[in-house]
């Protein structure tokens, strides 16, 4: 069969071969699409609710006025000239919409380096056949489930016109020390060869690199943490960020209701005041920061210091990212 | 007998919008053919607006893509025209008509864009 | 864009003669099994009437005096003979990929 490819909504015409250019001409046309339940037979005669989907013409061509999805399928022509002789045509016709532009929607204008980050998600509507659609960075096609880029995709059909609606949600880990300005682009690709691909404009997000924090220090005076009855403990964080961060203070993991301030000062030590003690610096950059945590504790006279190995763990990192 | 009426306003505001109507009698816009919208300019020159398909998708002329709309309401047997941001250039008599062999057209209205 | 080009913009034709008008297309209209140009009547005051479909056929009702021919960029409609009510213009239009109309020949009876 010939393949014969239409745009929803165009004429087409479908050429009898064989047959004589006017009547009285033997032909008789077979269509097998979407609209029949199985082979339609059209004559030259035609008349009936057929003429406004498919009329055979003067010069026994088959005419569709206007084709739809429903008209995809085989037409088949079979026609004798004036001699006898026998003339078969067979096309197999199919037929395309051509969608809008695609666009990217709910573009980011920033990502952070090394962690994943959603670029977009471009949306292609109105096309038949569906087609596909494929991500480029800086030109270059970008491959799902490599070096960090996965991608989302959906595919919805239009109830009443049977158009196809795609979309395609483009995560990426930028890495470190990469470019900081990367142009995505994403195109649409028709399910029916000879047609070009269609391009979204490209984006250009800024990728952002965390700078790797500086430990918040935790020092305790005396050393180790342990004081007798009536002691004083000074409990002092150093932040090397500039601008100094506001300093909040933390004991056994509750916040205690003090303003900030870099210096905690524990004077005339009782039983209440002893346990788990930590800084928590907050930056406006990048959020707050825990030190490592310090045990306070009483020596009843006569007792040994503690060895600084009874000092806490080392702290709970950052805490959350701006 | 199949017939097409345009109808609308014949006055638009530059910038404003136009929407036009074209009612058809005698033949139901979702059974087949493609809907037209056509438009003639003062010096006669005929520009083919866009279509809506018998089963709703659409197409439009490439220079009008951004500013138009087609759509349509099967239970009144109605296919609209809007035409956004017009200007004076827009001034002309507007036409509907059934596509494939355009035979049928409406008798036109004209719509002048004026302050 | 396919742009269509009609000669001449006008002509003068005596009662009973040939008129002859020219259609060119900036690329192909056609296929191998047919040429999707087609061609109309119009006259003041009316919407322009179809004449000719896809290049050759007659549309039903209209005289046979009126005949189209021509495939790929080249097509013309003939007017023969000419009669009085023939004084119109008349456009060319394709419906290859998507649609366009000629210029005109504005058609005047001597």
């Known amino acids: 069969a010939q393949n014969i490819t239409a745009r929803i909504g165009e004429p087409l015409v479908l050429k009898c071969k064989g047959a004589p250019k006017k009547p009285p001409q033997r032909l008789e046309w077979k269509l097998n699409t979407g609209r029949t339940e199985a082979w339609k037979v059209l004559s030259p005669q035609g008349g009936g609710p057929w003429d406004s989907v498919a009329r055979v013409l003067p010069n026994g061509s088959l005419f569709l006025p206007a084709v739809g999805i429903q008209d995809e399928g085989i037409f088949r022509c079979q026609a004798m000239n004036r001699n006898g002789k026998e003339t078969k045509s067979n096309y197999r016709v199919r037929v395309y919409q051509i969608p809008g532009k695609p666009e990217i929607v709910d573009s980011a204008s920033e990502l952070t380096a090394g962690v994943p980050n959603k670029v977009g998600t471009c949306v292609s509507e109105g096309s038949y056949p569906a087609g596909t659609l494929s991500w480029h960075l800086d030109g270059k096609p970008l491959v799902p489930n490599e070096k960090g880029v996965s991608v989302k995709e959906q595919t919805r059909r239009h109830p009443e016109t049977g158009l196809f609606t795609l979309q395609s949600e483009l995560m990426v880990t930028p890495a470190r020390g990469g470019d900081p300005r990367p142009t995505f682009s994403c195109s649409f690709s028709p399910g029916l060869p000879r047609h070009r691909a269609l391009r979204t404009a490209p984006i250009q997000p800024r990728v952002w690199e965390p700078v790797p924090l500086e430990e918040v220090q935790l020092v305790v005076e005396p050393e180790g943490g342990a004081v007798a009855p009536g002691g004083t403990v000074t409990l002092t964080c150093e932040v090397p960020a500039q601008p100094s961060p506001q300093i909040h203070w933390m004991k056994d993991g509750v916040p205690l209701p003090l303003p900030p301030s870099p210096v905690l000062i524990l004077p005339e030590i009782g039983p209440q005041d002893q346990g788990t003690y930590s800084c928590v610096a907050t930056h406006s950059s990048h959020g707050p920061q825990e030190s490592r945590a310090v045990s306070i504790s009483i020596i009843e006279p006569g007792e040994e210091g503690p060895t600084a190995g009874s000092v806490g763990g080392s702290g709970l990192g950052t805490l959350a990212l701006a | 007998d199949v017939q097409l009426q345009e109808s609308g306003p014949d006055l638009v505001k530059p910038s404003q919008s136009l929407s036009l109507t074209c009612t058809v009698t005698?033949?139901?816009?979702?059974?087949?053919?493609?809907w037209h919208w056509i438009r003639q300019f003062p010096g006669n020159k005929l520009e083919w607006m866009g279509y809506?398909?018998?089963?709703?998708?659409?197409n439009y002329n490439p220079s009008l893509k951004s500013r138009i709309s087609i759509t349509r309401d099967t239970s009144k047997n109605q296919f609209f025209l809007q035409l956004n941001s017009v200007t004076t250039e827009d001034t002309a008599t507007y036409y509907c008509?059934?596509?494939?062999?355009?035979?049928?057209w409406g008798q036109g209205t004209l719509v002048t864009v004026s302050a | 864009d396919i742009v269509l080009t009609q000669s001449p913009a006008s002509l003068a034709v005596s009662l009973g003669q040939r008129a002859t008008i020219s259609c060119r297309a900036s690329?192909?209209?056609?296929?191998?099994?047919?040429?999707?140009m087609h061609w109309y009547q119009q006259k003041p005051g009316q919407p322009p009437k179809l004449l000719i479909y896809?290049?050759?056929n007659l549309e039903s009702g209209v005289p046979a005096r009126f005949s189209g021919s021509g495939s790929g960029t080249d097509f013309t409609l003939n007017i023969h003979p000419v009669e009085e009510e023939d004084a119109a213009t008349y456009y060319c239009?394709?419906?290859?990929?998507?649609?366009?109309f000629g210029g005109g020949t504005k058609l005047e009876i001597k």
């Open positions: 008509a059934r596509g494939g062999d355009f035979a049928y």
């Open positions: 005698g033949y139901s816009i979702t059974s087949g053919y493609s």
């Open positions: 809506i398909h018998y089963s709703g998708s659409t």
């Open positions: 690329k192909s209209v056609g296929t191998s099994d047919s040429s999707y």
């Open positions: 896809l290049a050759s």
């Open positions: 239009q394709h419906s290859r990929e998507l649609y366009t």
